[in-house]
């Protein structure tokens, strides 16, 4: 469970894959899109508001009581829209909502290079948001090796 | 309870190499980014070393890079650093500490006792 | 590298008194910095996280502030057990200790 309704802190990035590819979002016939794209010189990156919140570790099992916290994220280009995980679809959407914010809209926070993090979908563990023909999906990893496979990590710039 | 438990301290001569070794409890070691820190006599804390979970990315500062590794066997629930060509600006007090949450290398949320490292001929 | 620049290296306060302690970044760590509490021959202890967050346990009377580049300890009230030396550190980029604030009995 998130141990508070209030994000722990919050950080305005701009969003980018390890490979430099820019995450952009583009307002189409009243939603959102999201695309993968190379910017060109000097075209302004879109900025993610990412706010952290705690959570305690799901698994009993941990033996770390209450100690074993993570940190999960929410993701939002745009005033009142997030990031969803659509695990049916295995797709990364944009979804208008109000606050309390459903599970689909928190991610696990990793970050298995000091300068790259990944998003874990709360909702189905071991799914993690990532880059799949210029558009972002989501990706099964089988195991912790597979964590920094490149098409799952994300660098988060203020620039 | 969380517990970290470091040994391998001692006397070594200037050019020589040690291991540290730090037994971690009460926690899943695998989850978690840990660190090794220091503190030279009367001084402050210096970061000398960073390890991700799986342990396949490590990190280093200037002072200590190509002379120390950091490892980790995440079965044995133990953290390493082994320490060669050491200088006698190494001699300090060598903590080792785990990340604050799984998964991140965010905040150092516990901290061992130390062991004492002097380097002196 | 980052650079952490704290002030003042020591200071001297009684007890009751407010205490504020600054840290500054040679660049932006956005709010990612932590404050430390050691006390002589023990192992540091983590008393804020993020710039602004409690450890659990750790006494009201402990505060935090900043972002960027300035951030600041703030002890309102000073307590017998408050005597020790603290560290900030950064982890934005890297991960940086400042060189530390000893708070001394005057």
């Known amino acids: 469970s998130i141990t508070g309704i209030s994000p722990i802190t919050e950080y305005l990035a701009s969003l980018s894959t390890y490979n430099d590819q820019s995450i952009t979002f583009a307002l189409e016939d009243e939603s959102y899109e999201i695309y993968v794209e190379d910017l060109k010189k000097d075209e302004k990156k879109d900025k993610v508001l990412l706010s952290y919140y705690e959570s305690q570790h799901p698994s009993n099992e941990s033996g770390d009581g209450v100690d074993g916290k993570m940190l999960m994220v929410t993701l939002s280009p745009t005033k009142d829209f997030w990031l969803h995980a659509n695990n049916k679809e295995h797709s990364v959407e944009l979804h208008k909502c109000e606050k309390p914010l459903p599970d689909q809209a928190f991610f696990v926070l990793h970050n298995m290079h000091s300068n790259c993090v990944s998003f874990e979908c709360k909702t189905d563990p071991g799914v993690f948001i990532g880059v799949k023909d210029n558009h972002l999906a989501l990706i099964k990893v089988d195991s912790s090796e597979n964590l920094c496979t490149e098409n799952i990590l994300f660098k988060l710039s203020e620039t | 309870e969380v517990q970290l438990v470091e040994s391998g301290g001692g006397l070594v001569q200037p050019g020589g190499s040690l291991r540290l070794s730090c037994a971690a409890s009460g926690f899943t070691f695998s989850s978690y980014w840990m660190y090794w820190v220091r503190q030279a006599p009367g001084k402050g804390l210096e970061w000398v070393a960073s390890?991700?979970?799986?342990?396949?990315?490590?990190y280093y500062p200037d002072s200590v890079k190509g002379r120390f590794t950091i490892s980790r066997d995440n079965a044995k629930n133990s953290l390493y650093l082994q320490m060669n060509s050491l200088r006698a600006e190494d001699t300090a007090v060598y903590y080792c500490?785990?990340?604050?949450?799984?998964?991140?290398?965010?905040?150092?949320?516990?901290w061992g006792q130390g062991t004492l490292v002097t380097v002196s001929s | 590298d980052i650079q952490m620049t704290q002030s003042p290296s020591s200071l001297s306060a009684s007890v009751g008194d407010r205490v504020t302690i600054t840290c500054k970044a040679s660049q932006n760590i956005n709010k990612h910095l932590d404050w430390y509490q050691q006390k002589p021959g023990k192992a540091p202890k983590l008393l804020i996280y993020f710039t602004n967050n409690l450890q659990t346990g750790v006494p009201s009377r402990f505060s935090g502030s900043g972002s960027g580049t300035d951030f600041t300890l703030t002890i309102s009230s000073l307590q017998p057990e408050d005597f020790a030396t603290y560290y900030c550190f950064q982890y934005n980029n890297g991960w940086t200790f400042g060189g530390g604030t000893k708070v001394e009995i005057k």
């Open positions: 500490a785990r990340g604050h949450y799984y998964y991140t290398s965010y905040s150092l949320g516990y």
């Open positions: 390890i991700t979970p799986d342990g396949g990315n490590t």
